[in-house]
């Protein structure tokens, strides 16, 4: 009785269970009752990452420098190339097909998380007691200067964009 289902790492073809090709190899010819499945290794620029019956290997991803991409991990016969973005850029999507410059955090906002090749800068508003007076992709909110520790007094209050202005204490005679 011909099989209707096959074991793991097998496939059903013309009432016959054949072994799938292992990762890194493509199918050349189905098995027969007498012959094992014929598989061939993928060429240097190609890969297959699963047990398969593909007759063509997939091309490795190309990390196009014109799109700001560079190779993070070279592909093998079993894995695709992993691209990342050049310094100052990050991927536009999870598949990292192109790059855009990191955004800067505007005055009044500080960097919560510095951008990587795959994620953009995360900004946060400077809370009371902190400020940022620059547009930056690296700088966090800085604390207001503590006038007291310098034996000074606050002459002008700080904001989320400006530091406090300290001045000498008025000495009453």
């Amino acid at each position: 009785e011909p099989p209707t289902a096959c074991r793991e790492k097998q496939y059903l073809i013309n009432s016959q269970c054949c072994s799938l090709c292992q990762p890194g190899q493509k199918l050349v010819s189905d098995c027969t009752e007498f012959t094992e499945t014929e598989c061939l290794p993928c060429s240097e620029s190609e890969f297959l990452d699963t047990w398969n019956r593909e007759t063509r290997c997939h091309q490795h991803k190309y990390c196009d420098p014109n799109l700001g991409l560079q190779v993070q991990q070279k592909g093998t016969s079993e894995t695709d190339t992993i691209c990342t973005c050049e310094e100052g850029l990050h991927c536009t999507s999870e598949s990292c097909e192109s790059c855009v410059p990191h955004r800067s955090c505007l005055p009044g906002f500080g960097v919560k998380q510095i951008a990587t090749g795959v994620s953009d800068t995360i900004c946060e508003p400077c809370p009371v007691g902190f400020f940022s007076n620059v547009s930056s992709a690296f700088e966090k909110c800085r604390p207001w200067t503590s006038c007291e520790t310098k034996d000074l007094v606050v002459q002008q209050a700080g904001t989320n964009k400006t530091d406090v202005v300290c001045g000498p204490q008025d000495r009453q005679r």
Epitope: I13, N14, S29, D30, C31, T32, E33, F34, T35, E36, E38
Partner: antibody, heavy 117, light 109 residues
Framework: QVQLVESGGGVVQPGRSLRLSCAAS????????MHWVRQAPGKGLEWVAV????????YYADSVKGRFTISRDNSKNTLYLQMNSLRAEDTAVYYC??????????WGQGTMVTVSS | EIVLTQSPGTLSLSPGERATLSCRAS???????LAWYQQKPGQAPRLLIY???ARANGIPDRFSGSGSGTDFTLTISRLEPEDFAVYYC??????????FGGGTKVEIK
């Protein structure tokens, strides 16, 4: 390159025995089933026998069943056909051929067996 | 046993002409497991077509196979001098035995 080379043919008297060999090279012999096919002088092709890649399954044409035995030695990359009780009608060129789901894709050049008294 | 009948027995044609060879099976050939072979005098057969219509590696595209079930055809669109030979069909779906047709000889007219 992929190649099959038969040997062992010759002239033999009726009732006697002969063993044919088929040496394989250029491919993973132990992964393929193998066939013997023969061709009598001036006639068409006749399938004789098949053996599975590991030597477990064997099938024969009715005309040779009980007289011929197909076997293989994967360590030597060689296929065999033991022919006993030979008859005049076994006179033919004997070819070995590789089994695939695409048919017999590789053939040897053949070896001539003549059964004559 | 599947019996394969090839026709015609001999085909006399000139180079450049189209050749149409027929192979008829006594019962349906499962999965179209039918192959065509070419054999020249003193040589081993050579696989041309498998699965009724797929060309084997290195076979020129003037050779084509068609058909399914019980009726199969090998067509040579424009005969070249090297195409004059004997052609055999073979079924490899239902065995034993693997059966061959009786052959068609394509000769120069």
């Amino acid at each position: 390159q992929v190649q099959l080379v038969e040997s062992g043919g010759g002239v033999v008297q009726p009732g006697r025995s002969l063993r044919l060999s088929c040496a394989a090279s250029g491919f993973t012999f132990g992964s393929y089933g193998m066939h013997w096919v023969r061709q009598a002088p001036g006639k068409g092709l006749e399938w004789v026998a098949v053996i599975s890649y590991e030597g477990v399954k064997k099938y024969y044409a009715d005309s040779v069943k009980g007289r011929f035995t197909i076997s293989r030695d994967n360590s030597k990359n060689t296929l065999y056909l033991q022919m006993n009780s030979l008859r005049a009608e076994d006179t033919a060129v004997y070819y070995c051929a590789r089994d695939t789901s695409r048919g017999h894709d590789i053939w040897g050049q053949g070896t001539m067996v003549t059964v004559s008294s | 046993e599947i019996v394969l009948t090839q026709s015609p027995g001999t085909l006399s044609l000139s180079p450049g002409e189209r050749a149409t060879l027929s192979c008829r099976a006594s019962q349906s050939v499962s999965y179209d497991y039918l192959a065509w072979y070419q054999q020249k005098p003193g040589q081993a057969p050579r696989l041309l077509i498998y699965g009724a219509s797929a060309r084997a590696n290195g076979i020129p595209d003037r050779f084509s196979g068609s058909g399914s079930g019980t009726d199969f055809t090998l067509t040579i669109s424009r005969l070249e001098p090297e195409d004059f030979a004997v052609y055999y069909c073979q079924q490899y779906a239902d065995y034993p035995p693997f059966t061959f047709g009786g052959g068609t000889k394509v000769e120069i007219k």
